[in-house]
């Protein structure tokens, strides 16, 4: 076809500078010489259609994907990536082809796929296809520990499915509450992956490789404490394992457990018992309840009873996929300069959920509390009382949440100035928002009272850096006040901040700044 | 560009300790895990220990635990590794290299690997009387 | 702990010969595995990573196969910048192993 452009697409690969994710058709890095893609007309194709060779990627790399048209006369393109519209510029270069470019910064899972070009010359329309993958890594993770029992054997096994291949510790602990957090001397750990000794308080598998330490507990009844005042709830996806452990003291042997789902007794090879006598003669016995594939129909309330102690149930649900529950309407808090202010989120998620707090694009650390209630809370105290946007973010494998939260700081107003030849303004941040006032300085008014309305233009706009307001005032200058020392002043509950500003002709321009409380 | 350059080799005497840095500059440090590899004269390549990205998990070979530390501080794009009780068979050359990128797949922690993909020039440390 | 036996520990080859090298190890280890050249002196230089996937700017003539137990690093066209000592790495679990190395001489 004697119509169709002479195509090149190139491949330009960027050394980064730590760039911010996103698109953009302008590249601020080092970049290597282009690679040619060689984009070929694909044969058997309804309209023109020109592919180039596959790219690729490494995670994080910045490539361009840059497509060189020789066709006379204007163009005009889109892009198109995963059905969505992208932006597109063309510009033409030194030997006057057009030049139609697509920025990929800090390559990431989500940005792998194909990317359409769509081009309409004045002679034809045509379109371009790139695809573009991530090159083959290997993902080291992390994942939380579960149990199994060991076959023939009175003991559990705690599998973690991480690379690489995790350390895996049992820590125990005999004593009740506090004196079970992690370095307290009742605290014992073990270094190994089964464990035969079942009878302690608290028990729990961690596992840990260099990208952290995941821990799950044995989830227990114990009939010799007091139930709590809600019921303890178990969530499970389709085909965990799982496992409850029910352990009850008497004086003597002579009492016996059973678990029941919904009044009906659990079937055998679901469950098994241990039984032991303590330092003091008395009998510990345990009860495990196990199915190491959950299905649907295994939820319910699994009931503990012993003939000689009051009987505790647990509900346990077995969810399809994963979830995280909380609100997501955004928060807006206003606190003094020296207030003592947390943020915080109530949830409640399975599986467990992965977090961070951030603020100004940077991510701080998140930690997680369990409550009572099945419900967790993530606090973030760190916010050194910078006022703006503070974002929440959880993912588990099914789920995402996200909520935004505002932080504005009580403060008196502080005045910026600046003038050009044609006006001056003032900028303040303080908060409340001020409102503004702009004053005459003259032979008549000494002090700057004679007030100026004309030519006042106020605005509020976002400072993009904290996601803070910043207010603003703008005076348009005019023969009246030229020459003149003026005044503009920001106020809000909490005091007066003013600027003097001299009207001159274009050049230096002295500020006096003037702070009234 | 990507870059590790090692300090802190010498020579020492047995028992003795040393601290080994390792600059690194030209990518976030701050997002990869890092390893400290030694080289002993004439013989083979021998893994010593890694750190992850914020610097709380470590782990060690044998031949080093509860001799070696490694630590990084991430403000000054720097990994270290504290040598004490320094034995004659720790002579080698000692190398830092990088280890994984940190990211995050549906809520699970992971880091994109592709081996240590860039190492310094390596410092040498010499333990004799 | 994992043991990495790569063989042979040597071997005398000529410009242009297809060279192989083996690495086994004492347990399955996936795919987590990686081959490495070093040059007297110099500090080792990833070559394959992920049992078979080419490092950036290495020369297509270099290859990698294998997953489990068994791995294999093949030069399909020795050059004469190739010759150098070459390791294999398992990263499956702690402590991470080297093979004992293969040194390319010129025949």
């Known amino acids: 076809n004697q119509d169709l452009p002479v195509i090149k697409c190139v491949l330009i690969n960027h050394k980064n500078n730590d760039s911010s994710v996103g698109k953009s058709s302008s590249y601020p890095m080092v970049s290597e010489s282009p690679e040619d893609l060689g984009c070929a007309l694909r044969p058997q194709s309804s309209g023109t259609v020109y592919e180039a060779a596959a790219v690729e990627v490494d995670v994080s790399a910045s490539i361009t994907l840059q497509v060189l048209v020789d066709a006379p006369g204007n163009i005009s393109c889109l892009w198109v990536f995963k059905h969505s519209s992208l932006n597109c510029q063309p510009h033409f270069d030194l030997q006057n082809r057009g030049v139609v470019s697509m920025v990929i910064l800090k390559m990431t899972e989500t940005q792998a796929g194909e990317y359409l070009l769509f081009i309409q010359s004045e002679a034809t329309n045509y379109t371009i296809l790139f695809t573009v993958s991530i090159r083959n890594t290997l993902l080291y993770t992390l994942r939380r520990p579960y149990f199994r029992k060991m076959e023939n054997q009175d003991a559990l096994v705690c599998i973690s499915e991480s690379v690489p291949e995790p350390i895996v510790e049992w820590v125990l602990c005999d004593s009740q509450g506090e004196s079970c957090k992690e370095e307290s001397p009742a605290v014992v750990k073990k270094e190994e992956k089964v464990l035969h000794e079942l009878f302690g308080t608290d028990i729990r598998c961690c596992a840990r490789n260099e990208l952290g330490r995941e821990c799950t507990r044995l989830f227990t009844i114990d009939l010799n404490q007091t139930p709590q005042t809600t019921l303890p709830q178990l969530f499970l996806k389709v085909g965990e394992p799982l496992w409850i452990r029910c352990k009850a003291v008497h004086v003597n042997h002579g009492f016996g457990l059973t678990w029941e789902l919904e009044n009906k007794a659990l079937e055998e090879g679901n469950y098994f018992e241990m039984s032991t006598y303590s330092t003091n003669r008395t009998m510990i016995r345990i009860l495990f309840a196990f199915v190491s594939s959950v299905a649907r129909n295994d939820t319910g309330y699994y009931t503990c009873s012993s003939s000689k102690h009051p009987s505790q149930s647990a509900l346990v649900t077995i969810v399809e996929k994963g979830f995280i529950n909380a609100t997501n309407s955004s928060e807006d808090y206003e606190i003094d300069q020296y207030e003592e202010f947390c943020f915080s989120v109530r949830f409640k998620a399975y599986p467990q959920i992965r977090c961070t707090w951030t603020f100004s694009r940077k991510s701080f650390p998140c930690e997680q509390k369990g409550l009572d209630n099945g419900y967790s809370i993530s606090k973030f105290c760190n916010h050194k009382h910078q006022p703006g946007e503070y974002i929440f973010h959880a993912e588990n494998d099914d789920a995402q949440f996200t909520k935004m939260f505002t932080l504005n700081i009580r403060r008196k107003p502080q005045v910026l100035a600046e003038a050009s030849a044609s006006q001056a303004s003032c900028f303040s941040d303080g908060y409340p928002l001020p409102s503004w006032t702009w004053k005459k300085c003259s032979d008549k008014s000494p002090n700057c009272t004679e007030e100026i309305t004309e030519g006042v233009w106020n605005r509020k706009a976002n400072r993009k850096v904290f996601g803070q307001w910043v207010s603003s005032s703008t005076l348009n200058m005019s023969e009246a006040i030229k020459g003149f020392l003026v005044k503009c002043c920001a106020y809000n509950s909490l005091g007066t901040s003013c600027e003097t500003i001299l009207l001159n002709s274009p050049g230096p321009f002295p500020f006096i700044q003037d702070n009234i409380s | 560009q990507v870059q590790l350059v090692e300090s802190g080799g010498g020579v020492v005497q047995p028992g003795r300790s040393l601290r080994l840095s390792c600059a690194a500059s030209?990518?976030?440090?701050?997002?990869?895990?890092m390893h400290w590899v030694r080289q002993a004269p004439g013989k083979g390549l021998e893994w010593v220990a890694v750190i992850s990205y914020e610097g709380s998990n470590e782990f060690y070979a044998e031949s080093v635990k509860g001799r070696f530390t490694i630590s990084r501080d991430n403000s000054k794009n720097t990994l270290y590794l504290q040598m004490n009780s320094l034995r004659a068979e720790d002579t080698a050359v000692y190398y830092c290299?990088?280890?994984?990128?940190?990211?995050?797949?549906?809520?699970?922690?992971?880091?994109?690997?592709?081996?240590?993909?860039?190492w310094g020039q390596g410092t040498t440390v010499t333990v004799s009387s | 702990d994992i043991q990495m036996t790569q063989s042979p520990s040597s071997l005398s080859a000529s410009v242009g010969d297809r060279v192989t090298i083996t690495c086994r190890a004492s347990?399955?280890?996936?795919?987590?595995l990686n081959w490495y050249q070093q040059k007297p002196g110099k500090a080792p230089k990833l070559l394959i990573y992920?049992?078979?996937s080419l490092q950036s700017g290495v020369p297509s003539r270099f290859s990698g196969s294998g997953s489990g137990t068994e791995f294999t690093l093949t030069i399909s066209s020795l050059q004469p910048e190739d010759f150098a000592t070459y390791y294999c790495?398992?990263?499956?679990?702690?402590?991470?192993?080297f093979g004992g190395g293969t040194k390319v001489e010129i025949k």
């Open positions: 030209g990518f976030t440090f701050s997002s990869y895990g």
């Open positions: 347990q399955s280890i996936s795919s987590y």
């Open positions: 790495l398992q990263h499956n679990s702690y402590p991470l192993t």
């Open positions: 992920a049992a078979s």
């Open positions: 290299a990088r280890g994984g990128e940190i990211t995050m797949v549906r809520g699970v922690i992971g880091y994109y690997y592709y081996g240590m993909d860039v």
